[in-house]
């Protein structure tokens, strides 16, 4: 029978080294055996390159294409072939279809004055356009209570978030994950990072009655304090305006 594309290729670029295209065939297909995606930059002298697709599901194919460090003007001509039969032809501009790389190495550290310091790595080298464009969303959830989750938007520079332990339930196990997007490129969200889990061992203040009360701000500089307040503000803002943003 004839080979047909059910959902035409949808492509995204990490804007540094790879573009990924995904499409759906009208019936289960051995993507690598039956199909080829050719791609060529619309630029004088650019050669034609071929991508061998892989199966994501029975009828869904995915192709990962190495690209050079993308720039805004880059436009690729894409052609999907089944042998000598051209199934689909289109163009793709990486700068208009950005999906950032996933933030890496998410870690949680106990910090001064009953705060947790969440840190992760910016997935782009400093010389890449996206390095300074990323903002992040951090999702913190209680492993045993699906209703207990918080979303923090990190819009300041620096891949860190300080959380006041008091905003989380004492003795509960929490998981955090982070994803990124680039506002100026009107990107989609990156995939979520792997989760990292920790135990929130903060004791509520009332349990300290009759005990010496430590100064919660001792040794905390004004920057750190501002970050805590900022994170709490964002959390409150997210909670009350969630439907506007997502």
């Amino acid at each position: 029978g004839s080979v047909k594309v059910l959902h035409e290729p949808s492509c995204f670029s990490d804007y540094i080294s790879t573009s990924v295209c995904q499409w759906k065939m009208d019936h289960p297909t051995n993507c690598s055996a039956e199909l080829r995606l050719s791609y060529q930059l619309d630029f004088m002298g650019s050669e034609n390159h071929t991508c061998v697709p892989e199966n994501r599901e029975d009828s869904v194919c995915v192709c990962s294409m190495p690209i050079d460090d993308a720039v805004e003007a880059d436009v690729y001509q894409l052609d999907l072939w089944a042998g000598q039969q051209l199934l689909w032809s289109g163009s793709f501009q990486p700068s208009k279809h950005v999906k950032p790389r996933t933030p890496g190495n998410l870690t949680v550290h106990p910090n001064i004055s009953h705060t947790w310091l969440l840190m992760w790595t910016n997935p782009y080298p400093t010389e890449n356009h996206l390095h300074s464009e990323l903002t992040y969303m951090v999702n913190v959830s209680n492993d045993n209570d699906p209703e207990d989750f918080k979303v923090y938007n990190v819009t300041y520079m620096g891949p860190t978030l300080r959380l006041a332990a008091s905003t989380l339930k004492s003795g509960a196990s929490y998981s955090a994950r982070v994803r990124a997007w680039a506002q100026t490129y009107n990107s989609t969200w990156s995939d979520w990072s792997p989760s990292t889990t920790w135990l929130n061992y903060y004791e509520p203040w009332e349990q300290h009655l009759g005990k010496p009360i430590p100064n919660p701000l001792l040794g905390l500089d004004s920057t750190g304090l501002n970050d805590i307040f900022e994170a709490q503000k964002i959390e409150w803002h997210e909670h009350h305006h969630h439907h506007h943003h997502h």
């Epitope: 930059l41 630029f43 004088m44 002298g45 650019s46 050669e47 034609n48 390159h49 190495p66 690209i67 050079d68 720039v71 805004e72 003007a73 880059d74």
Partner: antibody
């Protein structure tokens, strides 16, 4: 040392044919696009044709399209220009030059960074 | 086609002085930040052309730093400081952005 040596220039009658060759040495020939540029006596430089490293992409000036064919033999490190239906206005010194690196997705550009010594083509009856 | 226009067409400069040649393109040669596909070539009398500047401002290998290129988009300048007798020849600008590649008419530099 990077070097280009052209040959094949000659006196030919209008309507005749000629094949120019350009032998390259001192660099990885297959990785680079190559270009032909010509210069009529006492005139400026005029681009003629371009071929990518693999030979998969070719471009021509309107003045020669359909009459000239650019090709390359990467095993022999040689660039060719087949010239058919020659006209008096094709009289010029023909230079080959090394153009952009095309083995990368976006060609890396260094200008026409090496030129041959040129070969003279004279079309006259 | 992109039209390249050079000015002046001839120039006479005393040794040690600075020579400036302008080149204007009919459309922008800026592909991305820092990548203007504009070259400068020198053809000395009786010789093949040789590359001086590529991508608007990058000096080709072996070219002295007396030669400098500047400009972006459609307006470019080649400056030759401390001109020497050996700099005599015809200078061409060329756009390498798209086919057909096109050259300026050439500027003849004469040393007084």
């Amino acid at each position: 040392e990077v070097q280009l040596v052209e040959s094949g220039g000659d006196l030919v009658k209008p309507g005749g044919s000629l094949r120019l060759s350009c032998v390259a040495s001192g660099f990885t020939f297959r990785d680079y696009a190559m270009t032909w540029v010509r210069q009529a006596p006492g005139k400026g430089l005029q681009w003629v044709s371009f071929i990518s490293g693999s030979g998969g992409k070719t471009y021509y000036a309107d003045a020669v399209k359909g009459r000239f064919t650019i090709s390359r033999d990467n095993a022999k490190n040689t660039l060719y220009l087949q010239m058919n239906s020659l006209r008096a206005e094709d009289t010029a010194v023909y230079y080959c030059a090394v153009d952009r690196l095309t083995k990368t997705i976006r060609p890396q550009y260094y200008g026409l960074w090496v030129w041959g010594q040129g070969t003279l083509v004279t079309v006259s009856s | 086609d992109i039209v390249m226009t050079q000015t002046p067409l001839s120039l006479s400069v005393s040794p040690g002085e600075t020579a400036s040649i302008s080149c204007r393109s009919s459309q922008s040669l800026l592909y991305s930040i820092g990548y203007n596909y504009l070259d400068w070539y020198l053809q000395k009398p009786g010789q093949s052309p040789q590359g001086l500047i590529y991508l608007g401002s990058k000096r080709a290998s072996g070219v002295p730093d007396r030669f400098s290129g500047s400009g972006s988009g459609t307006d470019f300048t080649l400056r030759i400081s401390r001109v020497e007798a050996n700099d005599t020849g015809v200078y061409y600008c060329m756009q390498g952005l798209q086919s057909p590649l096109t050259f300026g008419q050439g500027t003849k530099l004469e040393i007084k």
